[in-house]
């Protein structure tokens, strides 16, 4: 399980990739088959890893979700899958793109009109800790004074990139998800080889601005496959 | 409103075994990662493990890793310590608390490794 | 590991007066990925901070966070009686997490 993977000592250490996600000290570059991630500034991977592409939504990209490929498949087995759009069947809001919400089984739009008299605890309480500033999330104590808070900033928990302020997304650090710094120009960033390859990123990376694509580095073609360093780049 | 309420402290003798309880209420207590913290009598916060929201994930302080499980029941809305091997400098309060930056806490337990 | 190191150890000032606590950190945080605790006697710690220089929910407009690198600071503008505690940093930016060792805000 990912969790024995995690827990393992059983790992080689590798030298820190050039540079970091926005600086980020631990942002490991994946390199599938295997696992990045940080121990400490140690860098670490886990060979030919393959039977559990994903455990948990977070592992996923922001227009992903964790779930079997089938269904009634092996719960065991679970890849990223594209998040369902508004209208489509859900069991939980990861399962439903950005800028919707899973309510009552079907993904619904959470822009702000949605929650004017309508605020359900489902909401609330997943998202409404006041101090991460969720936009629109609002315990029911609070609506008189406080309908909306503004968004995440950089290190604030959240849930999924729309409850991060402009230029930042949620990415997974540790055990929780906190807003990050998009990536910019020129900064190393994360290519994911085949879709549910992600693998454990425990430092996971923001995905690249507008008008930038992860793309290999021009210097790194001669690199190994696993080695290849990428990088934001304008299309 | 948000509660984190821990239990199993007590006395127990080097070597032995404890479980402490992490109680929580308030919030959708599957979206959130979790966090253990101890604070040994007089001196300052060390922070000893956590765990993901689903539980896939767990993180351990190198003082107590292969001694310390850290798990939860999401049906449960419970965190757990497993702890074994304890030693006399495991003595502490045990706090709970919730996510990365440790928003919400919980009153503290009292473990005593003593013989 | 990234240490922190706290400072002063012990502030005495009175009420009404501003506090300026420092915490150092032993390599670059990159990313403000700080927070800044209050405890008191017999309680748990509260937060007060994170992400350098946010406020946590309920925190007076008296209490901010500021800085970058390896130098930050909590400022509290003007003391009231239920400042007086232990303040702690701590650094969610790198494996493993850990806090400074405190800086104790008494009155004078």
């Known amino acids: 399980t990912l969790n024995s993977v995690l827990n393992s000592n059983a790992i080689k250490n590798l030298p820190p990739p050039l540079g970091g996600a926005a600086g980020h000290p631990g942002s490991a570059v994946s390199a599938a088959p295997g696992i990045l991630y940080p121990g400490g500034n140690k860098y670490q991977t886990i060979d030919n890893y393959q039977p559990y592409p994903c455990a948990e939504d977070e592992e996923c990209g922001t227009d992903e979700y964790c779930a079997s490929p089938t269904r009634g498949g092996d719960a065991g087995v679970q890849i990223c899958l594209a998040c369902r759009k508004r209208r489509k069947r859900c069991m939980r809001h990861a399962m439903c793109c950005p800028g919707n919400y899973c309510k009552n089984g079907i993904c619904v739009s959470s822009d702000q009109n949605n929650f004017r008299g309508e605020i359900e605890e489902t909401i609330t309480e997943s998202f409404g800790n006041d101090h991460s500033t969720l936009d629109g999330y609002s315990r029911r104590t609070t609506l008189s004074s406080k309908m909306y808070h503004s968004k995440g900033q950089e290190g604030s928990v959240c849930l999924r990139s729309s409850d991060c302020a402009t230029g930042l997304c949620c990415a997974r650090h540790f055990w929780s998800k906190i807003c990050k710094p998009v990536l910019k120009e020129g900064q190393v960033c994360t290519k994911h080889r085949r879709k549910g390859s992600h693998g454990l990123e425990i430092f996971q990376r923001c995905y690249c601005g507008e008008g930038l694509s992860c793309r290999i580095q021009k210097d790194h073609h001669q690199a190994s496959n696993s080695s290849r360093l990428h990088t934001c780049q304008r299309h | 409103q948000v509660q984190l309420v821990e239990s199993g402290g007590g006395l127990v003798q080097p070597g032995g075994s404890l479980r402490l309880s992490c109680a929580a209420s308030g919030f959708t207590f599957n979206n959130y990662g979790m966090t253990w913290v101890r604070q040994a009598p007089g001196k300052g916060l060390e922070w000893v493990s956590g765990i993901s929201g689903s539980g896939s994930y767990t993180y351990y302080a190198d003082s107590v890793k292969g001694r310390f499980t850290i798990s939860r029941d999401n049906s449960k809305n419970t965190l757990y310590l497993q702890m074994n091997s304890l030693r006399a400098e495991d003595t502490a309060v045990y706090y709970c608390a919730r996510t990365i930056y440790m928003d919400y806490w919980g009153q503290g337990t009292l473990v005593t490794v003593s013989s | 590991d990234i240490v922190l190191t706290q400072s002063p150890a012990t502030l005495s000032l009175s009420p009404g007066e501003r506090a300026t606590l420092s915490c150092r950190a032993s390599?670059?945080?990159?990313?403000?990925?700080l927070a800044w605790y209050q405890q008191k006697p017999g309680q748990a710690p509260r937060l007060l901070i994170y992400g350098a220089s946010n406020r946590a929910t309920g925190v007076p407009a008296r209490f901010s966070g500021s800085g970058s690198g390896t130098d930050f600071t909590l400022t509290i503008s003007s003391l009231e009686p239920e400042d007086f505690a232990t303040y702690y940093c701590?650094?969610?930016?790198?494996?493993?997490?850990?806090f400074g060792q405190g800086t104790k805000v008494e009155i004078k």
């Open positions: 390599q670059n945080l990159f990313s403000p990925y």
């Open positions: 701590q650094q969610y930016g790198d494996e493993p997490i850990t």
